[in-house]
């Protein structure tokens, strides 16, 4: 008999608002798992260190992810 699992996602609320990549301290992408069935994106802002969950389905957030990965690929040799 499988044990019943409690869903333990981090994000209680999400934001669709565009985020300036320059204002980001850190961007965490947590893949879906047995504990949380959805992808979670957590942005830590440089100013005040505020943390915010971003909507992976939002066009603005998809664009942000593209911009961040582009920036990373530029940096890597």
């Amino acid at each position: 008999v499988p044990l019943s699992r409690t869903v333990r996602c981090t994000c209680i609320s999400i934001s669709n608002q565009p985020v300036n990549p320059r204002s980001l301290e850190k961007l965490e992408i947590i893949p879906a798992s047995q504990f949380c069935p959805r992808v979670e994106i957590i942005a830590t802002m440089k100013k005040k260190g505020e943390k915010r969950c971003l909507n992976p389905e939002s066009k603005a957030i998809k664009n942000l992810l593209k911009a961040v990965s582009k920036e990373r690929s530029k940096r890597s040799p």
Epitope: C9, T10, C11, I12, S13, I14, K51, R52
Partner: antibody
Amino acid sequence: QVQLVESGGGVVQPGRSLRLSCAASGFTFSTYGMHWVRQAPGKGLEWVAVISYDGGTKYYADSVKGRFTISRDNSMKTLYLQMNSLRTEDTAVYYCAKDLGDLPPGLDYWGQGTMVTVSS
Amino acid sequence: QSVLTQPPSASGTPGQRVTISCSGSSSNIGSNTVNWYQQLPGAAPKLLIYTNNQRPSGVPDRFSGSKSGTSASLAISGLQSEDEADYYCAAWDDSSEPRVVFGGGTKVTVL
């Protein structure tokens, strides 16, 4: 502006059930977590439950676990609290509150509350 | 018994400074931000301070918050008669079952 209006309170006998509703307006309901908090007469605030923006994550206070169920209907912009096996100690004003939106979760806007009295 | 500990009462004369403490543990205040709520008599609670020290628009700058370790405090400077209310601290708690925890509340009286 943000508005939260609770309804469904009333007088109920111990062991019976009641369902509270909270109608939300003035913000994008489907992207915010929502909370229920209660306040017994003359007492402090007690957090009851939270539900995530999509309804997939729910957390409860130990005092209501297994008896109360939080749910939401994003198309109706409505939050619910199903209260079963009610006890006299559940007598309180029940407030719904919008989540702050950032991490960690917190509460910003509150409704005016609905009174639940559990009495025989 | 509340998870966060506040003094039950505090008082001051108009113009004075009043400070309310809120003590918690590593799983709540120690690892998360603190919010403060004001509840005027017969009214619903209202957010006064969020993220330890941020004021929502419309809240006078007489109200300020701070956090250090597992404790937080709310200061009201230039106390006014309309500040007579109950004040509650709250924080997210990352213990085995995540939850919001409140302080027991502090009744502020303006003498």
